[in-house]
């Protein structure tokens, strides 16, 4: 608060304004300010056993202001209150107290928790999670082909993070074992998925080609007799996908 404090300067009678300092309109030797200049707030300050009137540009901490027609007056909030709307309603408590519905409390009531940042009692917030997303495709080392047993995962999102006293969040991802109909990897599915593939130095005239993992169940190389037309390949892919879903089991 930028306070413009008017105090007695020399001995004088009450209601005599000459010699009043700062924002005082009238003052007395014993009581300090008796009234203030326009727009300033009048407050009583306790000094020892007596109260001294002061004029301020706004009410100090622990007081609230009322603009009456003839005087702007500061009134004390309750003892445990730092900022208040009026005598009944505190809006900020003194250190060590928590604000709840306009009152300052040592501890928050049942069902509420203390927010040590705002120093208010707030509702306990429990964790909320979404529904599970669908299971991922069955994979092994990042591939969806060339194996029999793999894993599939599913995830869900945290919609509401819990507050300090709220229920903790349940797991947000799950993994389970799955089995698939053995499926030969197509050309585009070969390569460095999961681990680095072993490479052999090519002989003269041989092209550099990734050698399938030793655990791969079938060679991905095709011989002419095994080639299918595009129509049949598409059909096969759809069937494989259906098999993967229908055959996968939880272990």
């Amino acid at each position: 608060q930028n306070a413009s404090r008017g105090r007695r300067q020399r001995r004088m009678h009450p209601n005599v304004s000459q010699g009043c300092q700062g924002g005082c309109a009238t003052c007395s030797d014993y009581n300090g300010c008796l009234s203030c200049k326009p727009r300033l707030f009048f407050a009583l300050e306790r000094i020892g056993m007596k109260q001294i009137g002061v004029c301020l540009s706004s009410c100090p901490s622990g007081y609230y202001g009322t603009r009456y027609p003839d005087i702007n007056k500061c009134t004390k909030c309750k003892a445990d209150c730092d900022t208040c709307f009026n005598k009944n309603f505190c809006t900020k408590c003194k250190s060590g107290f928590y604000l709840h519905l306009g009152k300052c409390l040592d501890n928050c009531p049942e069902g509420l928790e203390a927010n040590n940042h705002t120093m208010e009692c707030v509702s306990i917030v429990h964790c909320e999670v979404s529904e599970w997303n669908p299971w991922s495709p069955c994979t092994k080392k990042g591939k969806t082909c060339g194996f029999k047993r793999g894993t599939e995962t599913r995830v869900r999102e945290i919609i509401q993070h819990p507050s300090a006293k709220g229920n903790l969040c349940p797991p947000t991802n799950e993994t389970r074992k799955c089995t698939v109909q053995r499926k030969k990897c197509q050309k585009g599915e070969r390569g460095k998925k999961g681990r680095e593939r072993k490479r052999k130095k090519p002989n003269k005239g041989e092209s550099k080609e990734a050698i399938p993992d030793s655990k791969s169940l079938e060679s991905s190389k095709e011989i002419p007799e095994q080639r299918e037309n595009k129509q049949q390949q598409k059909k096969r892919k759809v069937q494989d996908k259906q098999k993967s879903v229908s055959v996968s089991t939880v272990h």
Epitope: Y64, T66, R67, Y68, P69, D70, F85, N86, K87, N88, F89, T91
Partner: antibody, heavy 116, light 107 residues
Framework: EVQLVESGGGVVQPGRSLRLSCAAS????????MAWVRQAPGKGLEWVAT????????YFGDSVRGRFTVSRDNSKNTLYLQMNSLRAEDTAVYYC?????????WGQGTMVTVSS | DIQMTQSPSSLSASVGDRVTITCLVS??????FVWYQQKPGKAPKLLIY???RLQDGVPSRFSGSGSGTDFTLTISSLQPEDFATYYC?????????FGQGTKLEIK
């Protein structure tokens, strides 16, 4: 429990006087500025008057200034509204209320009808 | 005197609706602002003080917002007991002034 109970309402002729009382309990009456707020039938709320906690100053709405006076007896926890030179437009329910910037506690109201 | 312009003057809504009432003030009053609820034949009841703070016992579906000259009362999901008249009031300076009121009726 806070209670404010108004009394003294009734039917009165224009130009006559009426005195309303309000008995307070359940809070420290002498700590509060007290006010009268009125509501004409089917209309909104209108502040009438406020007297400060110690009775030393009082303030009035434009429509009643010079005709109404407000007083209090802190030893009896009672607020009064003296209404003189009553007019038809003063017809309303009069509520006694604790006034501390907001009107925190209200009585149930007393009806004043000014009619010839 | 500070003028208060409350709108709408009346409003029809259904149980479960979200309802908003506004109050415009003729000068900056910071957050020195109050909302009241009044039911027929009863005294007004203080709902919200300091523009946004709920009075003890007021359900959390009520909320207040605003500062300066524009203020809003929101009821997030109307309940049967919320059908009443609502008034705003500035508590910034004398004389205390009220809005004209908003009558909330069942559709």
């Amino acid at each position: 429990e806070v209670q404010l109970v108004e009394s003294g309402g009734g039917v009165v002729q224009p130009g006559r006087s009426l005195r309303l009382s309000c008995a307070a309990s359940g809070f420290t009456f002498s700590d509060y500025d007290m006010a009268w707020v009125r509501q004409a039938p089917g209309k909104g709320l209108e502040w009438v008057a406020t007297i400060i906690y110690d009775g030393s100053r009082a303030y009035f709405g434009d429509s009643v200034r010079g005709r109404f006076t407000v007083s209090r007896d802190n030893s009896k926890n009672t607020l009064y509204l003296q209404m003189n030179s009553l007019r038809a437009e003063d017809t309303a329910v009069y509520y006694c209320t604790a006034h501390d910037r907001s009107f925190d506690y209200w009585g149930q109201g007393t009806m004043v009808t000014v009619s010839s | 005197d500070i003028q208060m312009t409350q709108s709408p003057s009346s409003l029809s809504a259904s149980v479960g609706d979200r309802v908003t009432i506004t109050c415009l003030v003729s000068e900056d009053i910071s957050n020195d602002f109050v909302w009241y609820q009044q039911k027929p034949g009863k005294a007004p009841k203080l709902l919200i003080y300091a523009a946004s703070r709920l009075q003890d016992g007021v359900p959390s579906r009520f909320s207040g917002s605003g500062s300066g000259t524009d203020f809003t009362l929101t009821i997030s999901s109307l309940q049967p007991e919320d059908f009443a008249t609502y008034y705003c009031q500035q508590s910034y300076k004398y004389p205390p002034t009220f809005g004209q009121g908003t009558k909330l009726e069942i559709k």
